[in-house]
């Protein structure tokens, strides 16, 4: 049974709460290290691979040392969702061409999703101002050619990993200041 | 073959500072964090810090915040770790070693660099 | 900081037997499916090397007779048959929070 009726919630641990975001943050890391090695291997593609319609890393947004949780929570959130719909529209323009890296992408998309969902429940137990909705985004143009399609999957899986990473680094180094 | 090379062993007076470089090649450089580990005589192996070469400067074991600083020249795919305020007790061997993104285990490691600190 | 202590930490041996090298955290380091620690070898004058991470994957380049084992707060390095090139100091670390810690070593010497 739970607390009796009128009676507030224990309020969350946040370190705990912090803890079980970074864990999650940290698999969905390793996953996409994985496929990462998986496309490497099957269309390997020398060289910095851009997209526009990425978001600028976050590791620009300053350094770690002197970032506050709403703010690294805000930005991983803002990225993140950025990411999960270019790992849709992947999925979507290069379905053929990438079918040897499922079900690793839909696994991927999975997990970001479950990320985001995990983000936005930090977010409100911590008591943090809810973002309005994003503005829809305007459609993303298809690959001009498999081959674009390719560098755009570089592109987007490289810029994910360095934004797990720095998500890991700074919501760990918040951890410790918790 | 990946490999990192630092550069040679220093004498320093206690109160000065010493920089260290890292020079990796053989991997895309903005891959991997880089890390920095002390060992100093008879004490166990400690983390110092790491760094991530694409940006948003580096994190630090709290021992070391406030005497340890690390950069990276991307383009000379060079890391550096400077280390002021000298004592007798950073007497050790510095090594830089390339860590795994989010994961901090670390499969290459440079030569170290012995740091003597002495009056 | 989480403090990883080993053990024995000195352990003497003859080539061709089975070496068990244990590594205790003072407080668990398996989350999700994952264990943060990591084994390494060290030689006199030389870097460490990384054998096993993430608890039981064996680094490329090292001989599968190097195996890792554990969850939680016990963890365990095994050499299933000690060459002479083995005899070295051994060191778990993890890296399930910051700052990420080394245990003490345990020195592995020839019989």
């Known amino acids: 049974p739970g607390p009796p009726p009128g009676s507030p919630r224990a309020s969350p641990d946040p370190r705990a709460e912090l803890d079980s975001t970074v864990l999650l943050t940290r698999s969905l890391l390793e996953d996409t290290r994985q496929l990462t090695i998986q496309l490497k291997d099957k269309f390997p593609a020398d060289g910095d691979h851009n997209l526009d319609s990425l978001p600028t890393l976050a590791m620009s947004a300053g350094a770690l040392g002197a970032l506050q949780l709403p703010s690294v929570l805000t930005r991983l959130r803002a990225d993140l969702l950025s990411y999960l719909r270019h790992v849709q529209w992947l999925r979507r323009a290069m379905g053929s061409s990438l079918k040897t890296l499922e079900p690793e992408l839909g696994t991927l998309q999975t997990r970001l999703d479950r990320l985001l969902r995990r983000l936005q429940l930090l977010m409100s137990r911590l008591a943090l101002p809810q973002l309005p909705p994003d503005p829809p985004a305007p459609p993303l143009a298809p690959p001009s050619s498999t081959w674009g399609g390719i560098r755009a999957a570089h592109a987007i899986l490289g810029g994910l990993h360095l934004t797990l990473d720095w998500a890991v680094r700074g919501l760990l180094l918040l951890k410790t200041r918790l | 073959e990946v490999q990192l090379v630092q550069s040679g062993a220093e004498v320093k007076k206690p109160g000065a500072s010493v920089k260290i470089s890292c020079k990796a090649s053989?991997?895309?450089?903005?891959?991997?964090?880089m890390d920095w580990v002390k060992q100093a005589p008879g004490q166990r192996l400690e983390w110092i810090g790491d760094i991530n070469p694409h940006g948003g400067g580096p994190i630090y074991n709290q021992k070391f915040t406030g005497r340890a600083t690390l950069t990276v020249d991307k383009s000379a795919s060079t890391a550096y770790m400077e280390l002021s305020s000298l004592r007798s007790e950073d007497t050790a061997v510095y090594y830089c070693?390339?860590?795994?993104?989010?994961?901090?285990?670390?499969?290459?490691w440079g030569q170290g660099t012995t740091v003597t600190v002495s009056s | 900081d989480i403090v990883l202590t080993q053990s024995p930490a000195s352990l003497a041996l003859s080539p061709g037997e089975r070496a068990t090298l244990s590594c205790r955290a003072s407080?668990?380091?398996?989350?999700?499916?994952?264990?943060?620690i990591h084994w390494y070898q060290q030689k006199p004058g030389q870097a460490p090397r990384l054998l096993i991470y993430?608890?039981?994957n064996l680094e490329s380049g090292v001989p599968a007779r190097f195996s890792g084992s554990g969850s939680g707060t016990d963890f365990t390095l095994t050499i299933s048959s000690l060459e002479e090139e083995d005899f070295a100091t051994y060191y778990c670390q993890h890296s399930r929070d910051l700052p990420p810690t080394f245990g003490q070593g345990t020195k592995l010497e020839i019989k």
């Open positions: 407080k668990s380091v398996s989350t999700s499916g994952y264990s943060y």
């Open positions: 070693a390339r860590g795994e993104l989010g994961h901090w285990y670390f499969d290459v």
């Open positions: 053989g991997y895309t450089f903005t891959d991997y964090n």
């Open positions: 993430l608890a039981s």
